[in-house]
Structure formats: structure tokens, C-alpha cells
């Protein structure tokens, strides 16, 4: 995968008039790595581990970098001629990437009420638009404007895609991205499902990179995909990411089952666990309610391995 | 490619015990099962147990609880069966097999024959 | 323990022929079961996993079929090297248990 770093700003309108102060998100590596949410916003690092290797002067140009185009978003939101009653918001995404083969690649998006309505190469310069008339008509209004701004002109576009990449680059060089690995904790849980029968939920939980293998085995062979069901994997607010797996097997059966881990090269197997039962409300149906698993993590009995 | 080298043939006296070695190479060991068959002289084939070699969790026929132990050397890659209280019952061909993570005995071991004779 | 029938202790064909072997189950076991095969020299390898599905590098003159408790094992043009013995296999419930194995030989 490419080494990346992506600005993530956003601004709002309420029943026409610009709101002051902005959102700024920026991701280095998919990570989460400084967040601004006010005006005059300081950039903080996402996590002990950007701010154990980059000093305050990061924080501070970013935070300068981060409040001046806040200030140029708002203006543009301004223009935008179609503002009616209501709260609005104009997000601007900004991504630059270095390859294995030291290639790169920057672009530009916009989106108006999350709908993007227009996105630009900063290397070549290219702008391209959906196909939809109201996409368009933003496009063309938000161009013009941009034309009209002389600061938007052809060397502010190579600026922008060079000012990244030099930021991208200052990072990678200070270690902060250095391919680390962090591996996951595994835990197995099991919780009655129905007459005979119970459910197996294996999470991993604090790992980096995002890639992991999760998979319930029986006698060592991988279950097939349709009889398991699996969460996201989501990031867990500490610059790490977590995620599960479940699967519904008979009663007594359990020791032909692990939770089979791969991850960063590293692998793990985890038996399935016999404990005290307690009975409790899982947090995990509220952001996996997609999958199904409602009628299991409702409300379960989970024995703990002691 | 995946090869499991078990240890030569053994003539044992009864009452006594024998351990079989199973080597395995060409994968990494820890990520698989090691499973033991035992084949009878022109019989069929019975399953004895298997031992995970990450942790050690070992499932067994019941048949055969008391009388197989399976254990492993994570350092040679070597999964070992210990038979033990040998009787004439106990004379056969030893397998052990390994999977791919999709199938069940997979790969198997070229076997060792194991006499228990007086 | 789930009893596995192989009915056909053994069977005598031609090279080029289509043979078919079965297996029986003392009860349904939802396709979960494979087939190996035992060379004269006592060499082992899996043919065929989950019923239907082939172990990779196993000529595709093998194939495997049934459900519930009746499966098949079917050579379809014979070979020189197809002479060994065959065992079916659950693996459903525990203990896993193997057929008592159908010898192939030449006629």
C-alpha cells in the first residue's frame, strides 16, 4: 500500500449565512493523526503515538496550514448561489500519495451536503465532474469562483500538491509511519443462542496495521464463510483497530473449535473458553446491527474465561 | 512443499511405551493441526486425536484417552505421540497428517510401524 | 460414533473404465465428509473434501457426490496408478471415523 496523507475539511451554513470555525481531520496512512474543530483550532495528534515523535512546531504549522483553508472553504461556501433554508455543509478532500516506486498521486474533492460535485488531479490539473445537473450546476458556480481567486491559480494548485507531499515526506522521515505493527488482543466469549446450541465470538482488538485474519476453525479446518458472520474493522479511537467474528456451533462441541488469528505476519490460535456466566448487555449490537447478530448480543449469557 | 517425516520402525516388548516423531517442514508449523491415524494390519484407518502446536490443545478419540499422548516441540517443528502399556492390540502402522486450513488430513506422513512382540 | 458403510470391500475393473464407490453413514452428515486414497506402498492422499470438492493437484477424472447419508466416489476413466484402496470419512461428529475402504485392482 502507498504511504498517504489526506485532509478531511469540512465547513456548515445555517439558513444562509456561513457558520464560523471548521472541522479538519487529517489521516496519515489511514490512521487518524490531528483533528481541529474550531476556528482558531490548535491541531492535535490523534493518539500518544504521533505525539511522542513530532514536536509542538507540527502542530503549529498544520494548525496554520489547517485555519487558512478553513478560512478559503468558508468563502467558497459563501458563493455557492444555491444555499436555501436549513443547515448546509461544503467538505473539502484533499489526498496526496507516494508509491513503492516513488510515483505519486494528489487530488482534490468537493462535496456539498455529502454529495461530491467536484474533483481535481493536482498534477495534471484536471477537473471532472459527475453527470448530474444539480452536481454540475455546484461545479461550474464553485470553478468560477475559484478562477476568480487569484490566490487559485496554476502555481496555488502545484503548491497544494507539492506542500503535501513535502508534509508526507517530513513525516515519513520522522519515524512516526514506520510500518509499525501493533498485535491484536484476542478474546473468546460464548453466549447461549438457542435450545443446544451456542454462539462463539472471537474479537481482536488494538491492532495495527488493519489487515487481520479472523476465522473460526472446527478441528482445525476454516469454517465455511457462510456459516460465520464478522463485524468491521473499525478503529478504536487510539490509532489501533478491532473487530470480531462469530459463529453458532451445538452444545458440547466446543472443544472442536479456536479462533484461528493472522495478522502482520504473526498468528495465534484461541480455544473456546468454559467460565462463570454472566448475564449482560453488549455495546457491540449497536455498531454491527447490519450483520444480524441482534437476536445474539442483545441481551447474552457470556462466560468469561477466568 | 509441505512433507511430515515420522520415525522409523519400532519393536517393542509388552508393557513398555514408544514415542513416534512426526517432523514436519515446508509451512509454518504453528498454524496447523497435527492429527494421528492408526492403521490396524489390513485394517482401515482410526482416528486417535490431534494436538494444536501453537498452545498445545490436544482433542482425542476417546477410545484412545490413556493410551496415545500427543505433545510438540515448537523449536524442531516435531509433534510426537507417546503410546504407552503396549499389548499386541497396540501393533500397527502410525500416521500423523497435517491440513491445509481447508481440509482435514491433508498432507500425511509416510507412517511407522510400530510391533509389540515378546 | 457415526458408522461409515463401504459395502464393496472390493472391486475388480478395466483400465479406461467409469467406477463408482460408495459410502454410507450411520446417520446425515451434511457433506461433511472426504475421500483418501491408500497406494500398495501405504502412501496417503486426500482426493476429495466436502464431498464434491477436489484437493488441488487430483486429476479431474475424480469426483465426489451424495448427501445426507450416501456419498459416491466416482473414477471416470481408470487409470494405471488409480489402483489402491479408497476410504470415505466423516468429519460431522467426534470421533472422526473412516469406511473399512474399497480395494481397487484390475481385472
Known amino acids: 500500500e502507498p504511504h498517504s496523507l489526506r485532509y478531511n475539511l469540512t465547513v456548515l451554513s445555517g439558513d444562509g449565512s456561513v457558520q464560523s470555525g471548521f472541522l479538519a481531520e487529517v489521516h496519515l496512512d489511514g490512521q487518524p493523526f490531528l483533528r481541529c474543530d474550531r476556528q482558531k483550532c490548535r491541531a492535535k495528534p490523534q493518539g500518544q503515538w504521533a505525539e511522542d515523535v513530532l514536536g509542538n512546531k507540527t502542530w503549529d504549522r498544520e494548525t496554520r496550514d489547517l485555519t487558512g483553508n478553513g478560512k478559503d472553504l468558508r468563502m467558497t461556501l459563501a458563493h455557492i448561489k444555491d444555499q436555501k433554508e436549513g443547515l448546509h455543509s461544503l467538505q473539502e478532500i484533499r489526498v496526496c500519495e507516494i508509491h513503492e516506486d516513488n510515483s505519486t498521486r494528489s487530488s482534490q474533492h468537493f462535496y456539498y451536503d455529502g454529495e461530491l460535485f467536484l474533483s481535481q488531479n493536482l498534477e495534471t490539473e484536471e477537473w471532472t465532474m459527475p453527470q448530474s445537473s444539480r452536481a454540475q450546476t455546484l461545479a461550474m458556480n464553485v470553478r468560477n469562483f475559484l478562477k476568480e481567486d487569484a490566490m487559485k491559480t496554476k502555481t496555488h494548485y502545484h503548491a497544494m500538491h507539492a506542500d503535501c507531499l513535502q508534509e508526507l515526506r517530513r513525516y515519513l522521515k520522522s519515524g512516526v509511519v514506520l510500518r509499525r505493527t501493533v498485535p491484536p488482543m484476542v478474546n473468546v466469549t460464548r453466549s447461549e443462542a438457542s435450545e443446544g446450541n451456542i454462539t462463539v465470538t472471537c474479537r481482536a482488538s488494538g491492532f495495527y496495521p488493519w489487515n487481520i485474519t479472523l476465522s473460526w476453525r472446527q478441528d482445525g479446518v476454516s469454517l465455511s464463510h457462510d456459516t460465520q458472520q464478522w463485524g468491521d474493522v473499525l478503529p478504536d479511537g487510539n490509532g489501533t483497530y478491532q473487530t470480531w467474528v462469530a459463529t453458532r456451533i451445538c452444545q458440547g462441541e466446543e472443544q472442536r473449535f479456536t479462533c484461528y488469528m493472522e495478522h502482520s505476519g504473526n498468528h495465534s490460535t484461541h480455544p473456546v473458553p468454559s467460565g462463570k456466566v454472566l448475564v449482560l448487555q453488549s455495546h457491540w449490537q449497536h455498531h454491527h446491527h447490519h450483520h444480524g447478530l441482534n437476536d445474539i448480543f442483545e441481551a447474552q449469557k457470556i462466560e468469561w474465561h477466568e | 512443499q509441505v512433507q511430515l517425516q515420522q520415525s522409523g520402525p519400532e519393536l517393542v516388548k509388552p508393557g513398555a511405551s514408544v514415542k513416534v516423531s512426526c517432523k514436519a517442514s515446508g509451512y509454518a508449523f504453528t498454524k496447523y493441526n497435527i492429527y494421528w491415524v492408526k492403521q490396524s494390519h489390513g485394517k482401515s484407518l482410526e482416528w486417535i486425536g490431534y494436538?494444536?502446536?501453537?498452545?498445545?490443545?490436544?482433542v482425542y478419540n476417546q477410545k484412545f484417552k490413556g493410551k496415545a499422548t500427543l505433545t510438540v516441540d515448537k523449536s524442531s517443528s516435531t509433534a510426537y505421540m507417546h503410546l504407552n502399556s503396549l499389548t499386541s492390540e497396540d501393533s500397527a502402522v502410525y500416521y500423523c497428517?497435517?491440513?491445509?486450513?481447508?481440509?482435514?488430513?491433508?498432507?500425511w506422513g509416510q507412517g511407522t510401524l510400530v510391533t509389540v512382540s515378546a | 460414533d457415526i458408522q461409515m458403510t463401504q459395502t464393496t470391500s472390493s472391486l475388480s475393473a478395466s483400465l479406461g473404465d467409469r467406477v463408482t464407490i460408495t459410502c454410507s453413514a450411520g446417520?446425515?452428515?451434511?457433506?461433511?465428509l472426504n475421500w483418501y486414497q491408500q497406494k500398495p506402498d501405504g502412501t496417503v492422499k486426500l482426493l476429495i473434501f466436502y464431498t464434491s470438492s477436489l484437493q488441488s493437484g487430483v486429476p479431474s477424472r475424480f469426483s465426489g457426490s451424495g448427501s445426507g447419508a450416501d456419498y459416491s466416489l466416482t473414477i471416470s476413466n481408470l487409470e494405471p496408478e488409480d489402483i489402491a484402496t479408497y476410504y470415505c470419512q466423516q468429519y460431522s461428529k467426534l470421533p472422526l471415523t473412516f469406511g473399512a475402504g474399497t480395494k481397487l485392482e484390475l481385472k
Open positions: 494436538i494444536d502446536p501453537y498452545n498445545g490443545g490436544t
Open positions: 446417520q446425515g452428515i451434511n457433506n461433511y
Open positions: 497428517a497435517t491440513t491445509d486450513g481447508y481440509s482435514l488430513f491433508t498432507y
